[in-house]
């Protein structure tokens, strides 16, 4: 969007912004908009919150179309009510080792965070907090009703989880990469971020990728088969093109998405990979963005809860990126 044309704003009055979000002029100095926050997608017309020291990081100069709101170098982090300096590592609880980098916090789990799917010897796995122990452990609940019959067990399988190896050492560098954060949107296009020092200079850097856990328009519950409670990875009938702020992916993708459950469980990406996607914009500009592609999803009771900041922080993460 170039700023050379006359300013004209939407017909409705200036928006009401949520608490803590600044009402600012767009990047052209034309219209009042709610500032984008840390980790959100931004454009020239949708600027980041300047009062929080954020700027729109477009990545390479060739991609000056859509960026991610990023804190200026050295910006501190506020986490759990405590301020941490950029570069500072801290143990947020007995379960997580975290690092602050330019306003973003990346955390590594100190406990095993595998997703355990039902299996013949443990058809109803559940994580429980044991007295005197920090990390939760898996226990096997007895089934509430004995309706599980032999052939049905074929549907159960254990899934591998692939995570970064936190003890990888390379040329005097202890390579550490946090898990990808949860997608910022439960449906539609969002952003997922992580912190890593897996680079030539062993410097901590933030990485971001686009993500789509499921399309917003899909009514997935309709596809749940009779007698079932979940649809873990619904089949997408036709290849789709991704849309990003008016730009469209140049290729079509037969992407996998995560489904839904009707029994209180949530379905989240289990194994993912990161691939570049090229988007073509109406003005002909082409930009390349990294995007999460789902390999498998898992449906589980470890849904994000507001009662525990760390639980919700981690369980909304993407498991096992393979790229």
């Amino acid at each position: 969007q170039n700023c050379s044309g006359p300013c004209r704003c939407p017909d409705e009055p200036a928006p009401r912004c949520p608490a803590g979000v600044s009402l600012v002029l767009d990047g052209c100095g034309c219209c009042r908009v709610c500032a984008k926050q840390l980790g959100e997608l931004c454009t020239e017309r949708d600027p980041c919150d300047p009062h929080k020291g954020l700027f729109c990081d477009f990545g390479s100069p060739a991609n000056r179309k859509i960026g991610v709101c990023t804190a200026k170098d050295g910006a501190p982090c506020i986490f759990g009510g405590t301020v941490y300096r950029s570069g500072e590592s801290f143990q947020s609880s007995c379960k997580y080792q975290c690092t602050c980098l330019d306003g973003a916090v990346g955390c590594m789990p100190l406990c095993s965070m595998d997703v355990r799917l039902p299996s013949p010897d443990c058809p109803f796995p559940r994580r429980v907090k044991l007295p005197g122990k920090c990390c939760e452990e898996w226990v096997c609940d007895e089934p509430k009703d004995q309706t599980v019959v032999g052939p049905a067990l074929a549907a159960y399988r254990l899934e591998d989880t692939f995570g970064p190896d936190p003890t990888m050492i390379r040329a005097n560098c202890l390579v550490q990469t946090t898990e990808w954060s949860a997608c910022s949107k439960t449906c539609g296009m969002g952003i997922s971020t992580r912190v890593t020092n897996d680079n030539a200079s062993c410097r901590l850097e933030k990485q971001s990728r686009l993500c789509m856990v499921r399309p917003c328009e899909a009514d997935l519950e309709e596809n749940i088969k009779k007698g079932k409670k979940c649809i873990r990875t619904p089949k997408i009938s036709k290849p789709i093109k991704f849309e990003l702020s008016g730009c469209t992916s140049m290729k079509t993708y037969r992407a996998k998405f995560c489904g839904v459950c009707t029994d209180g469980r949530c379905c989240t990406p289990h194994r993912t990979t990161t691939l570049p996607v090229e988007f073509k914009c109406p003005d002909g500009e082409v930009m390349k963005k990294n995007m999460m592609f789902i390999k498998t999803c898992a449906c589980h009771y470890n849904c994000p809860g507001d009662n525990d900041i760390f639980e919700s922080l981690y369980y909304r993460k993407m498991y096992g990126d393979m790229a």
């Epitope: 969007q1 050379s4 044309g5 006359p6 300013c7 004209r8 704003c9 939407p10 017909d11 409705e12 009055p13 200036a14 002029l25 052209c28 100095g29 034309c30 219209c31 009042r32």
Partner: antibody
Framework: EVQLVESGGGLVQPGGSLRLSCAAS????????MAWVRQAPGKGLEWVAN????????DLLASLKSRFTISRDNAKNSVYLQMNSLRAEDTAVYYC????????????WGAGTTVTVSS | VVMTQTPLSLSVSLGDQASISCKSS???????????LEWYLQKPGQSPQLLIY???SRASGVPDRFSGSGSGTDFTLKISRVEAEDLGVYYC?????????FGQGTKLEIK
């Protein structure tokens, strides 16, 4: 009542300067763009300049950019047009207008102030 | 963008319909896909007043005998039943591209 009142016009010699003022009342001034439109004697309307809510963006007729400046003071509910190096062809009635910045442009106009550039 | 109005003057009997045409030298669709074509009336000795915005939307307090239509480069203002208070000069205006420009004006007289 919504009102715009211009002042500062008058007779000035070629090469001289004038500063026009427009005092606004009856509405939340900082919620609107403001503009200046002029009308030479016996001629049609000509857009001169407009300014955004807080004065951080101004747009002017290209041929006037080097000589004219639009500014505003939200604390005083006023918009200004600084005119330098005036020429005979700048002789006109200068209207201050409210610009909604949304659906329509000039929904409220002042009565105008006359600027005459002559030796 | 040059805005060309026709006719330049118009003499109409009270109660008759009046029609004024405005042609732009290029499409006046703004980059946000709206068309900012407006009509203003300047009554004798007065400041201009807004009649129509975005091609066909009537401004607050404007009687429904005024209507606007058109698209692309061709636009029309119609006054269905001319009244004595309608006399004056009518200007079309485009706000989609810089410089913002007015037509040269159409003078409406009462027969």
């Amino acid at each position: 009542e919504v009102q715009l009142v211009e002042s500062g016009g008058g007779l000035v010699q070629p090469g001289g300067s004038l500063r026009l003022s427009c005092a606004a009342s009856g509405f939340t001034f900082s919620d609107y763009y403001m503009a200046w439109v002029r009308q030479a004697p016996g001629k049609g309307l000509e857009w001169v300049a407009n300014i955004n809510y807080e004065g951080s963006r101004t747009d002017l007729l290209a041929s006037l950019k080097s000589r004219f400046t639009i500014s505003r003071d939200n604390a005083k509910n006023s918009v200004y047009l600084q005119m330098n190096s005036l020429r005979a062809e700048d002789t006109a009635v200068y209207y201050c207008a409210r610009d909604t910045s949304r659906g329509s442009y000039f929904d409220v106009w002042g009565a105008g102030t006359t600027v005459t550039v002559s030796s | 963008v040059v805005m060309t109005q026709t006719p330049l003057s118009l003499s109409v009997s009270l109660g008759d319909q009046a029609s004024i045409s405005c042609k732009s030298s290029q499409s006046i669709v703004h980059y946000n896909e709206n068309t900012y074509l407006e009509w203003y009336l300047q009554k004798p000795g007065q400041s201009p007043q807004l009649l129509i915005y975005k091609v066909s939307s009537r401004a607050s307090g404007v009687p429904d005998r005024f209507s606007g239509s058109g698209s692309g480069t061709d636009f029309t203002l119609k006054i269905s039943r001319v009244e004595a208070e309608d006399l004056g000069v009518y200007y079309c205006f485009q706000g989609s591209h810089f410089p913002l420009t007015f037509g040269q004006g159409t003078k409406l007289e009462i027969k």
